[in-house]
Amino acid sequence: PCKILKCNSEFWSATSGSHAPASDDTPEFCAALRSYALCTRRTARTCRGDLAYHSAVHGIEDLMSQHNCSKDGPTSQPRLRTLPPAGDSQERSDSPEICHYEKSFHKHSATPNYTHCGLFGDPHLRTFTDRFQTCKVQGAWPLIDNNYLNVQVTNTPVLPGSAATATSKLTIIFKNFQECVDQKVYQAEMDELPAAFVDGSKNGGDKHGANSLKITEKVSGQHVEIQAKYIGTTIVVRQVGRYLTFAVRMPEEVVNAVEDWDSQGLYLCLRGCPLNQQIDFQAFHTNAEGTGARRLAAASPAPTAPETFPYETAVAKCKEKLPVEDLYYQACVFDLLTTGDVNFTLAAYYALEDVKMLHSNKDKLHLYERTRDLPGRA
């Protein structure tokens, strides 16, 4: 597999913390860059087409040019990661007004309307319009694709031969924006939830408003929050068990900032999953309820999880974390029955917690069963 995240974290380790080279310590910094470049070359054959890899290679070339580094010379040994010192240069607060969405876009109008999209579990998708779907969407799919931001998820089967998948990789591209941010790429994979962009930075780069894009590690290796103030957007990425969850709060204006609706406008958070990718998990839930512990392989696209996980146990475990019998609770039950992996309980729980934090309409925190949704555009 593509090891670009390993390269990124080694570079980040070498260039942050108390032993890090100062900005004027060019030989040390160049050594770290040479190591980074070497690492990217070594993983090139497995990273073809990887957005984060692409971005890292270009970033290295730019940094080597800026610092006048030659590609010959010593390389650095990766150090253990340490926290950056207080007063880190990345903590600038003098961002221009254009880099604060609420101040600039809405100077003369009311507070913007915020929307929420989330992806978690098997995976379950909550769209910007509060539709709730369970999808197959195996492989790489666009979650968000607008003029400011591109989010791509890769979903892999939770069990061999299963149509039920979960998110194993997430790539977020923050596009270059005025004097606020350079293009930045964030990438997370199973067991690799970095607290930095692929170029090792934690903010929007060298522009005046760079601090309007910031990554904060909430729980090491488990919970990262990305604030993109210049577009009024907050993203939460978690690793729960083996898989990733994604949640975003974004102004409607940004959600709809799409130039080509025929191509860009097809993204999952906006349109939902195509009909042929949807799983009728509510029907599955009803059937499972009616059959008790008996497994209903026919009702589910996934192979059944071990027999040792009966319906009653799934219900009990989900009730424990999700006392309200809403769609998050039902998603939890579905995931336990189709995977046998108890971590999916936490995925549903945290997804709901993220809704509570990110959704602007507190009356819409819980979604309930209703008549069948109109499917997303195929």
Epitope: A37, L38, T40, R41, R42, A44, R45, R48, Y53, H54, V57, H58, I60, E61, M64, S65, S70, K71
Partner: antibody, heavy 123, light 108 residues
Framework: EVQLVQSGAEVKEPGASVKVSCKAS????????IQWVRQAPGHGLEWMGW????????NYLQKFQGRVTMTRDTSTRTAYMELSSLRSDDTAFYYC????????????????WGQGTLVTVSS | SYELTQPPSVSVSPGQTARITCSGN??????ASWYQQKPGQSPVVVIY???KRPSGIPERFSGSNSGNTATLTISGTQAMDEADYYC???????????FGTGTKVTVL
């Protein structure tokens, strides 16, 4: 001595396919990628793609995607390049070449080259 | 896609120095190789990793690479050096190889 020996010249009609072989000797066949390069008469070198003899994995230049197929037979230490839907502008020498690599620096270059196979596409 | 540009031809008198350039965006951050191809023959690598010479290649062949330009230098050029020369790099992003347009060296 490391050597790559290619099959003989071919004359093909437009629309046909050609399969060029490249037999390796003097080294462990599965340890090095085989690259394919072509050169139209009087023109420069054009990289076409590679095959990993160990896994059979390939990577083709976009312009050849869908028309080229690179395969290998590890038992005979032979790599093959098949080009289909031939056109007159596919007339060229086709070279197989071993990709040599410095694993410390992760750099690579091409050495040695096969003697080349002239493929002429003409009606 | 990545492109490498070379002058179509370079002329040099015997014993003089021939310099062949190869230009590409931020080429100095990549490792360049150079190949010599004589009429009717397969190419042969004369320089790899910017400046290294394979065994059997005369010392008069040297290479350098910085900025946007790689250069192959033939010092004390001999008649036998008359050939086409191609630069080449590995584009790690696509895992493709790119050849320069080629330069015909004529020894007057």
């Amino acid at each position: 001595e490391v050597q790559l020996v290619q099959s003989g010249a071919e004359v093909k009609e437009p629309g046909a396919s050609v399969k060029v072989s490249c037999k390796a000797s003097g080294y462990t066949f599965t340890d090095y990628y085989i690259q394919w390069v072509r050169q139209a008469p009087g023109h420069g070198l054009e990289w076409m793609g590679w095959i990993n003899p160990k896994t059979g994995g390939t990577n083709y230049l976009q312009k050849f995607q869908g028309r080229v197929t690179m395969t290998r037979d590890t038992s005979t230490r032979t790599a093959y390049m098949e080009l289909s839907s031939l056109r007159s502008d596919d007339t060229a020498f086709y070279y197989c070449v071993r990709e040599d690599m410095n694993t410390v620096l992760a750099t690579s270059w091409f050495d040695p080259w096969g003697q080349g196979t002239l493929v002429t596409v003409s009606s | 896609s990545y492109e490498l540009t070379q002058p179509p031809s370079v002329s040099v008198s015997p014993g003089q120095t021939a310099r062949i350039t190869c230009s590409g965006n931020q080429l100095g951050h990549k490792f360049a190789s150079w190949y010599q191809q004589k009429p009717g023959q397969s190419p042969v690598v004369v320089i790899y990793e910017d400046k290294k010479r394979p065994s059997g290649i005369p010392e008069r062949f040297s290479g350098s690479n910085s900025g946007n330009t790689a250069t192959l230098t033939i010092s004390g050029t001999q008649a036998m050096d008359e050939a086409d020369y191609y630069c080449q790099v590995w584009d790690v992003i696509t895992d493709h190889y790119v050849f320069g347009t080629g330069t015909k060296v004529t020894v007057l």
